[in-house]
Interface confidence: low
């Protein structure tokens, strides 16, 4: 019994004075607690607790279920205990079959023994199946068998407590281990759409999917920069043992402009938190914004192709698109398609394919688009660059040689004189008069230039070259001079050609 210093409270003393007591089933259990300040006896086994206010605990006919820890406590809160085993060959184990283990933690298979002298107290798999190779356990006859560091793979494991009695193996009732998974990663959250664009009065509904190993994951919808509680509805499923899914749906039945903002689906577990956001933009009316993908002033060479391309944002969806030139609508040569197949896409592309353009096909090409709320348009000014064409080359009554050329950009005309019959002309001749004429074609058509020289300056046989050129190319025409005596016998133009 404990020795006591005078004046200092001491724990009660118990008779018999042992830490463990073994009795046979049917025998009497008599325990005496001696203490001037006796308060109570307490009996504990598994989840069962009993109390007794008498200082002597008597059980006349002991049963296996009287196995357990008997504790005497005094008024100072000091206590002393004795553990009693009631040996019953027919009931070697007391069991509490509920068996839950938290992953990576230890868990106790509660099968305390009624006889501490049996041997080989251990765990065995059901139906002779072996236990997992990595399962480690520590037996304690008074408490049960502690499984160390529970693994997720042990979930639904069937096992028995086992002892050897008189050379025979005796099994307890079976236990089914239920493993509560540990959170080893943050929840996985995803949202049905990353952004929503609505008109006032339309319904906003967005679903957040939360995936984790168990249903104890927490989730909520929040509005950024707001504490207001949002109305949400839940659905949930268990896909197998450690695969839990929850869907949290947020709905605003009639969205307003001031509902616009960022909504966050937030989830957390003991490992950490995750979130995903969706952006809601509510507009009072639809819109269309057009963005040209090429310069709206286009220069293209004669005979070449050009694609007029626009991107545009349209909300609601575009209903009518058309390309127009000179008040005529294109029925083909163009295509219109969404920029992405994403259901929240509001960006579209329209392309007009102009092929082998002629000089007469310059002008304003207009793209028009409309939806239920607005119309929009963008114009492209297309200039077709053309090599100069010499339209007329005449000797005038007043003795002038006149050369008229058309092209785009505006051609320049130079004059050259070639002695004899050569057509390699080098001596340049200054024009007397140069004019840019008004073209009768469209405003984006060719520009016409007229240049004149005084032919009286030429005294010898030869050829006069009119050379018209611009950025695209050059074209020449020639006049031949033949003198008979003092008179110019012939002045006639050659066939036009480009050397």
């Amino acid at each position: 019994q404990p020795s006591v210093s005078p004046g200092e409270p001491s724990p009660p003393s118990i008779h018999p004075g042992k830490s463990d007591l073994i009795v046979r089933v049917g025998d009497e259990i008599r325990l005496l607690c001696t203490d001037p300040g006796f308060v109570k006896w307490t009996f504990e086994i598994l989840d069962e607790t009993n109390e007794n206010k008498q200082n002597e605990w008597i059980t006349e006919k002991a049963e296996a279920t009287n196995t357990g820890k008997y504790t005497c406590t005094n008024k100072h809160g000091l206590s002393n205990s004795i553990y009693v085993f009631v040996r019953d060959p027919a009931k070697l184990f007391l069991v509490d079959r509920s068996l839950y283990g938290k992953e990576d933690n230890d868990t106790l298979v509660r099968c305390p023994l009624t006889d501490p002298e049996v041997t080989n107290y251990s765990l065995k798999g059901c139906q002779g199946k072996p236990l997992p190779k990595d399962l480690r356990f520590i037996p304690d006859p008074k408490a049960g068998i502690m499984i160390k560091s529970v693994k997720r793979a042990y979930h639904r494991l069937c096992l028995h407590c086992s002892v050897d009695q008189e050379g025979k193996s005796v099994l307890s009732e079976k236990f089914i281990l239920k493993v509560r998974p540990a959170f080893k990663a943050v929840p996985v959250v995803s949202v049905s759409k990353a952004s929503y664009l609505l008109r006032e009065g339309e319904e906003f509904t967005v679903t957040c999917t939360i995936k984790d190993v168990s249903s104890s994951v927490y989730s909520t919808w929040k509005r950024e920069n707001s504490q207001t509680k949002l109305q949400e509805k839940y659905n949930s499923w268990h896909h197998g043992d450690f695969n839990y899914e929850r869907q949290a749906t947020l709905t605003i039945s009639s969205a307003r402009v001031n509902d616009s903002g960022v909504f966050m689906c937030y989830a957390n577990n003991t490992f950490g938190s995750a979130n995903v956001t969706t952006t809601l933009e509510v507009v009072d009316k639809g819109f269309i914004n057009i963005f040209p993908m090429i310069n709206t002033t286009v220069f293209v060479n004669d005979g070449e192709n050009v694609d007029l391309i626009v991107e545009y944002e349209a909300f609601p969806k575009p209903e009518h698109q058309q390309w127009i030139y000179m008040n005529r609508t294109f029925t083909d040569k163009w295509e219109d398609y969404p920029k992405s197949e994403n259901e929240s896409n509001i960006r579209y592309v329209s392309e007009l394919h102009l092929t082998r353009l002629k000089g007469t096909e310059g002008g304003t090409y207009t793209f028009l688009v409309s939806n239920s709320d607005v119309n929009a348009a963008i114009a492209f000014n297309v200039y077709v660059n053309t090599k100069p064409e010499i339209l007329t080359y005449d000797r005038l009554v007043n003795g002038m040689l006149q050369c008229v050329a058309a092209g785009f950009p505006e051609p320049t005309i130079d004059w050259y004189f070639c002695p004899g019959t050569e057509q390699r002309c080098s001596a340049s001749v200054l024009p007397v008069d140069v004019q840019t004429l008004n073209s009768s074609g469209p405003p984006f058509g060719k520009l016409v230039v007229q240049s004149s020289i005084d032919s009286s300056a030429f005294k010898h046989n030869g050829t006069v070259e009119c050379k018209a050129y611009n950025d695209v190319g050059k074209t020449s025409a020639y006049f031949n001079f033949a003198f008979k005596g003092n008179n110019k016998e012939q002045i006639h133009p050659h066939t036009l050609f480009t050397p």
Partner: antibody, heavy 122, light 109 residues
Framework: QVQLVESWGGVAQPGRSLRLSCAAS????????MHWVRQAPGKGLEWVAV????????YYADSVKGRFTISRDNSKNTLYLQMNSLRAEDTAVYYC???????????????WGQGTLVTVSS | SSELTQDPAVSVALGQTVRITCQGD??????ASWYQQKPEQAPVLVIY???SRPSGIPDRFSGSSSGNTASLTITGAQAEDEADYYC????????????FGGGTKLTVL
């Protein structure tokens, strides 16, 4: 139609603070960047600050950086300019102005408020 | 910070054409927009982009650009066009901040 109405300005002593607000209506406020521009008496226009459509980005002229704060409350369709450590040279008519192109922060300003006079004087 | 330079004052006879210019490095990269401001009133956008007019702005106002110079042209100036005109563009130093010219006072004689 678009309307921008600035709050009454007022008089403040140097070193003190003043807060301007601008109430917007007639357009989707939360879709457009908003600017503050000021004009000292008899002087030209000076760009002061801009906030992006969602208020997540702010930019300031060097002359006010660190002293002025632009902010917005999209739920109230209101733009603010918090002016701290005021100086005499901050005396001006302050205009709030709307960016022309949806979602673009630095763009042309298509609508302006009527302006409010802020006087900084001891 | 980059600057936009305008002539302080320009005058034009009623009905004549006047050109107000604005110079600055940023105009090599960006178009200028133009604002009209009458006494005791807020500025009004009159030209933006290459040569675009907001609705309600008369077609006598036009804009053009060449090199580091932007121009606002009023063809057939009216008495009501008398005002201060400010050009505005982005800062070319990479900050994208808005920069105003010093303003031009237009007098219609």
């Amino acid at each position: 139609q678009v309307q921008l109405v600035e709050s009454w300005g007022g008089v403040a002593q140097p070193g003190r603070s003043l807060r301007l607000s601008c109430a917007a209506s007639g357009f989707t406020f939360s879709s457009f960047a908003m600017h503050w521009v000021r004009q000292a008496p008899g002087k030209g226009l000076e760009w002061v600050a801009v906030t992006s459509y969602d208020g997540s980005n702010e930019y300031y002229a060097d002359s006010v950086k660190g002293r002025f704060t632009i902010s917005r409350d999209n739920s109230k369709n209101t733009l603010y300019l918090q002016m701290n450590s005021l100086r005499a040279e901050d005396t001006a008519v302050y205009y709030c102005a709307k960016a022309m192109v949806r979602g673009v922060t630095f763009g042309d300003l298509d609508y302006w408020g009527q302006g409010t006079l802020v006087t900084v004087s001891s | 910070s980059s600057e936009l330079t305008q002539d302080p004052a320009v005058s034009v006879a009623l009905g004549q054409t006047v050109r107000i210019t604005c110079q600055g490095d940023s105009l090599r990269s960006y178009y200028a927009s133009w604002y009209q401001q009458k006494p005791e009133q807020a500025p009004v956008l009159v030209i933006y982009g290459e040569n675009s007019r907001p609705s309600g702005i008369p077609d006598r106002f036009s804009g053009s650009s060449s090199g580091n110079t932007a121009s606002l042209t009023i063809t057939g100036a009216q008495a009501e066009d008398e005002a201060d005109y400010y050009c505005n563009s982005r800062d070319s130093s990479g900050t994208h901040l808005r920069v105003f010219g010093g303003g031009t006072k237009l007098t219609v004689l």
